[in-house]
């Protein structure tokens, strides 16, 4: 119960984080026009990864797209290649662990596929995270960079007689959501990974001996692992009490080296 | 279409207040930020600020901050610009116009003269 | 405050004639993020209140006679009116758009001879 629990919860934080790493993609406001200490301005600059947009006082938006590609920032082009491929992982990741929940039966398909397939997921929520977390945190860095330099050159001009007041932006609200998008799918991907553990079916190389004692009857298995996950022989033994009901979660409770936190 | 209602003329006595009122129609009123420009006799025109009938947020003339306080009654779709301490300073024609494209007044009221005067 | 200086302050011509007036500003009021000057050009005739014919420097206004053109970025900016019609008898006068306080330069008054 416990592992269907921890994937399934694990699937829909990874499906929020998604659908907030591709929220924050699209999202106009990854840099907004800093109005602290600056001259106030009847317009207010925004901009996204994929165009610029303009409100006036007025109420009147304009958006214009960056049709350029050669013309772009590099840093741009580098923030929005990690959101696109946290998109591209994440979707996949989603798609995968559909067919990996175990609340949903597809055929005669294992537990041991089960469990693969899980786990693949977990990691592509991981690495989807990282994507976003790492591409809003250049940007984010790129904006840090460039508020100072325009803060040192605020003001620019012939003999300070004309003046140019350079915008300087700061944190949009797109990187908030990509972080916290980000570190949903992390987490989403940790918990799909540690729901992996508890899904493959406990398998033994050999037949488990019975010993008899007073009262309860009781079954030893010596060092029985898992073949088919590939995990790491088990040193502990495990008791298996023949009169207490046990659910499929519960098998695989015990550490092994695959341990994802 | 859009109009701007605005009372002709006002009378006032030196130290006195007036409140000065602009009734809009013909757009959706607290969409748009009211704008109050003063015009004393052959003179140009001055801006002293403007509000946004949706929250009461405003902007001012630093010039005119402790004269004009503005304010707005969403019920009937008016615009109000409180003068106070009144002189003959202040003798002018006032004028209301909400924002329009490229941050410009477009629809201006006819404005209110108003005349302090002992 | 951003100061508008407006030069001439008035100028006298005859009908048909073509009229250029200038606007300056202490501040650039050109907008990186569209490109777009927040000037807007204003004609007042005597009696009534101020017209808009020109936003972000340049846009005509609906209705505004295409006889009246604005140029210019930055800080320097033109009004131009073609051909001089008894009508244009008026002041006229830039505004910034901008900045906060928005302030209007002093006017250019066109007389008819």
């Known amino acids: 119960m416990a592992v269907t629990a921890c994937q399934g919860l694990g699937f829909v934080v990874s499906l929020i984080g998604i659908a907030g790493i591709i929220a924050a993609t699209c999202m106009d406001q990854w840099s907004t026009q800093d109005l602290y200490n600056n001259p106030v301005t009847a317009v207010f600059n925004y901009q996204g990864l994929w165009r610029s947009c303009v409100r006036e006082s007025s109420g009147f938006t304009e958006c214009r797209g960056y049709f350029t590609l050669l013309g772009l920032p590099a840093m741009l082009q580098a923030v929005r290649a990690l959101m696109i491929v946290g998109i591209v992982l994440g979707a996949i990741g989603l798609l995968v662990s559909i067919f990996a929940l175990k609340c949903i039966r597809i055929g005669s398909m294992e537990d041991s596929a089960k469990a693969n397939m899980t786990l693949t997921s977990g990691i592509m929520f991981i690495v989807s995270g990282l994507c976003a977390i790492a591409g809003v945190s250049v940007f984010a860095n790129m904006l840090v960079t460039n508020f100072w330099m325009s803060t040192a050159n605020m003001y620019t001009g012939m003999g300070g007689m004309v003046q140019t007041v350079q915008t300087r932006y700061t944190f949009g609200a797109a990187l908030f959501v990509g972080w916290v998008a980000g570190g949903l799918t992390l987490i989403g991907g940790v918990m799909m990974c540690i729901a992996c553990r508890g899904l493959a079916p406990e398998e033994t190389n050999y037949k488990a001996v019975s010993y008899h004692a007073s009262g309860h009857s009781v079954a030893y298995k010596p060092g029985g692992f898992k073949a088919s996950t590939g995990f790491g022989s088990n040193t502990k033994n495990k008791k298996i009490y023949d009169g207490g009901a046990r659910t499929e979660d519960e098998v695989q409770s015990y550490p092994s080296k695959h341990d994802y936190v | 279409q859009v109009q701007l209602q605005q009372p002709g003329t006002e009378l006032v006595k030196p130290g006195a207040s007036v409140k000065l009122s602009c009734k809009a129609s013909?757009?959706?009123?607290?969409?748009?930020?009211m704008h109050w420009v003063k015009q004393r006799p052959g003179q140009g025109l001055e801006w002293i600020g403007n509000?946004?009938?949706?929250?009461?947020?405003?902007n001012h003339n630093e010039k005119f901050k402790s004269k004009a306080t503005l304010t707005v009654d969403k019920s009937s779709s008016t615009a109000y610009m409180q003068l106070s301490s009144l002189t003959s300073e202040d003798s002018a024609v006032y004028y209301c116009?909400?924002?329009?494209?490229?941050?410009?007044?477009?629809?201006w009221g006819h404005g209110t003269l108003v005349t302090v005067s002992a | 405050d951003v100061v508008m200086t407006q030069s001439p302050s008035s100028l006298t011509v005859t009908a048909g004639e073509k009229v250029t007036m200038s606007c300056k500003s202490s501040?650039?009021?050109?907008?990186?993020?569209?490109?777009?000057?927040?000037l807007t050009w204003y004609q007042q005739k005597p009696g009534q209140p101020p017209k808009l014919l020109l936003y972000?420097?340049?846009t005509r206004e609906s209705g505004v006679p295409d006889r009246f053109t604005g140029s210019g970025s930055g800080t320097d900016f033109t009004l131009t009116i073609s051909s001089v019609q008894a009508e244009d008898l008026a002041v006229y006068y830039c505004?910034?758009?901008?900045?906060?306080?928005?302030?209007f330069g002093s006017g250019t008054k066109l007389e008819i001879k």
């Open positions: 116009a909400p924002i329009y494209y490229g941050n410009s007044l477009a629809y």
């Open positions: 013909g757009y959706t009123f607290t969409s748009y930020w």
């Open positions: 509000i946004h009938p949706s929250n009461g947020g405003s």
């Open positions: 501040q650039s009021l050109l907008n990186s993020g569209n490109q777009k000057n927040y």
């Open positions: 972000w420097a340049s």
């Open positions: 505004q910034n758009s901008y900045f906060y306080p928005f302030t």
